[in-house]
Interface confidence: low
């Protein structure tokens, strides 16, 4: 046997090179046949009228042919025949890789509510061989469950991901990434999660700046409520009492001018959206008017939570004066 061939792997749409090589040549006819045993080339003569076949080289020791725009229907055994006595035949197998035609991601719900489990599906259509699908939420890899469907030598892979969403997932991409021998680099598609969550309420004292409230001073509190959808209603109430007559409510802001000891109490900002409602409390303690001693430096910290009560105690240097409990978020 002095007729040799090599197997070829090619990506659909690209060029395959088929070579029939003869070791000891005696100018015998070399012929190349397709899988249907139709002649593609007889020496440098092409009886097959498929212009995708082009002669790259013809000599007594080689017949080299290129097949452009390869399709899956070109896959199979190509026979080289050498017309010696007796005739020799050798075959080369063309394997065609087909990248997925389409990569589709489908989220069960456009908008999810925090704590909910949603189903995300990714389909890589009509590839050969079957595609491997990987899932990422942001930079974190997740585990999906894949199903492979075969049709006419092509594979459609569907991967299912069950995902429990949290408010931190809002705006985070869910990425379906494909791994396939015909794909170089990253082939991926993504959808951004939209997660609805109940408001987080936080009270900010915008006046006085040093955080110490004294008789005769003004107080300004701003209620910050963040949720999805954005809360439409932000309301101020005084817990267990009427709002002072001289209190002014303006949207998320509460103004109390000319503070006096009767204003002491808990002021609550309430916010709600379609997911739920939440509130944050501010405990006002009005101090005596200042003496000539300059006020101490004070710090205010507020933390929002729905389960833990955080008390921030602000004190000054005068003995016997009570601490002021400032803000509690719920």
């Amino acid at each position: 046997q002095n007729l040799f061939t090599k197997d070829v792997t090619v990506i659909e749409g690209e060029v395959a090179t088929i070579s029939c090589q003869v070791n000891k040549s005696d100018d015998s006819v070399i012929q190349l046949l397709n899988p249907n045993r139709q002649t593609i080339y007889f020496r440098d003569f092409r009886p097959l009228k498929d212009s995708r076949f082009q002669l790259l080289n013809f000599s007594s020791s080689e017949l080299k042919v290129s097949l452009t725009n390869v399709s899956i229907s070109d896959e199979g055994r190509y026979f080289c025949q050498l017309y010696t006595d007796p005739p020799q035949e050798s075959y080369t197998t063309i394997t065609v890789l087909v990248p997925p035609r389409n990569l589709m991601i489908d989220i069960q719900k456009d908008t999810a509510v925090e704590g909910e489990e949603i189903e995300v599906n990714c389909t890589a259509m009509a590839s050969k061989p079957a595609t491997t699908i990987r899932w990422f939420k942001g930079n974190t890899e997740l585990k999906g469950k894949s199903e492979v469907e075969e049709w006419s030598d092509m594979y459609t892979v569907t991967s299912q991901l069950m995902l429990k969403v949290h408010k931190e997932d809002d705006g985070v991409p869910v990425i379906c990434q494909v791994e396939h021998p015909a794909v170089t680099g990253n082939l991926q598609t993504q959808r951004y999660l939209e997660v609805q969550y109940k408001p987080q309420v936080h009270i900010q004292m915008t006046y006085p700046l040093q955080g110490l409230t004294r008789e005769g001073d003004a107080l300004e509190l701003t209620c910050e409520a963040i949720g999805k959808p954005q809360p439409v209603m932000v309301t101020w109430v005084r817990v267990d009492d009427e709002m002072p007559q001289h209190a002014v409510l303006s949207g998320p802001n509460l103004f109390i001018n000319n503070l006096n000891k009767t204003d002491n109490g808990t002021y609550r900002c309430e916010a709600s959206n379609i997911v739920g409602k939440a509130h944050s409390d501010y405990m006002l303690y009005v101090y005596d008017p200042p003496t000539t001693i300059p006020p101490p430096t004070t710090t205010t910290t507020t933390t929002t939570t729905t389960t833990t009560t955080i008390l921030t105690i602000i004190t000054d240097s005068r003995a016997g004066e009570e601490g002021s409990i400032r803000a509690v978020d719920h």
Partner: antibody, heavy 124, light 106 residues
Framework: QVQLVQSGAEVKKPGSSVKVSCRAS????????ISWVRQAPGQGLEWMGG????????NYAQKFQGRVTITADKSTSTAYMELSSLRSEDTAVYYC?????????????????WGQGTLVTVSR | DIQMTQSPSTLAASVGDRVTITCRAS??????LAWYQQKPGKAPKLLIY???SLESGVPSRFSGSGSGTEFTLTISSLQPDDFATYYC????????FGQGTKLEIK
């Protein structure tokens, strides 16, 4: 000088088959691709298929696929065209036509040499 | 299949005229086009192959041009022997002929 000589006229009944021959002389038979082209009365030319005699591999026009068989006998340098399931529309002059390899510049079935034609009449 | 459309179907001209016949392919066939002349009761005769190459023995008044989908056959100065039917033929994908153009004496 290459010559293609065809068999004589035929009269056939609808549903039957006809086999026309074409003998090549004046050259090496293996140098040819032999095609069959037909021409109905007053009509244009229609390529039916072709064969490379040395290998016996044939290609057919889609219209005739399954109804036409083209073969070659290398020992007698003769090509044959058999058309089955004849109907009246198959009444035509059938030409064999040869195209000769021009080395690497040969790219398809165009025809430098033609036979004299064979009239096939399909009639009840 | 590739369809070949010739125009005109019939052309009347006089000796000495310059004549052009057009052939259009339904898809690109590169330059794989041949032109034939056929006289009544005779087999066709190859004039041009590969769109513009003149077959040996064919008079130089015949010329071909074009590529892709548009092709023309030109006879620079008609001779009495040129009145016949002309066919274009693509051989990019097997073979298909045009429907023919009959060149008549005006």
């Amino acid at each position: 000088q290459v010559q293609l000589v065809q068999s004589g006229a035929e009269v056939k009944k609808p549903g039957s088959s006809v086999k026309v021959s074409c003998r090549a002389s004046g050259g090496t038979f293996s140098s040819y691709a032999i095609s069959w082209v037909r021409q109905a009365p007053g009509q244009g030319l229609e390529w039916m298929g072709g064969i490379i005699p040395i290998f016996g591999t044939a290609n057919y026009a889609q219209k005739f696929q399954g109804r036409v068989t083209i073969t070659a006998d290398k020992s007698t340098s003769t090509a044959y065209m058999e058309l089955s399931s004849l109907r009246s529309e198959d009444t035509a002059v059938y030409y064999c036509a040869g195209d000769i390899s021009r080395g690497s510049s040969w790219y398809g079935y165009y025809f430098d040499y033609w036979g004299q034609g064979t009239l096939v009449t399909v009639s009840r | 299949d590739i369809q070949m459309t010739q125009s005109p179907s019939t052309l009347a001209a006089s000796v000495g005229d310059r004549v052009t016949i057009t052939c259009r392919a339904s898809q690109s066939i590169s330059s794989w086009l041949a032109w034939y002349q056929q006289k009544p009761g005779k087999a066709p005769k190859l004039l041009i192959y590969k769109a513009s190459s003149l077959e040996s023995g064919v008079p130089s008044r015949f010329s071909g041009s074009g590529s892709g989908t548009e092709f023309t056959l030109t006879i620079s100065s008609l001779q009495p022997d040129d009145f016949a039917t002309y066919y274009c033929q693509q051989y990019n994908s097997y073979s298909t002929f045009g429907q023919g153009t009959k060149l008549e004496i005006k």
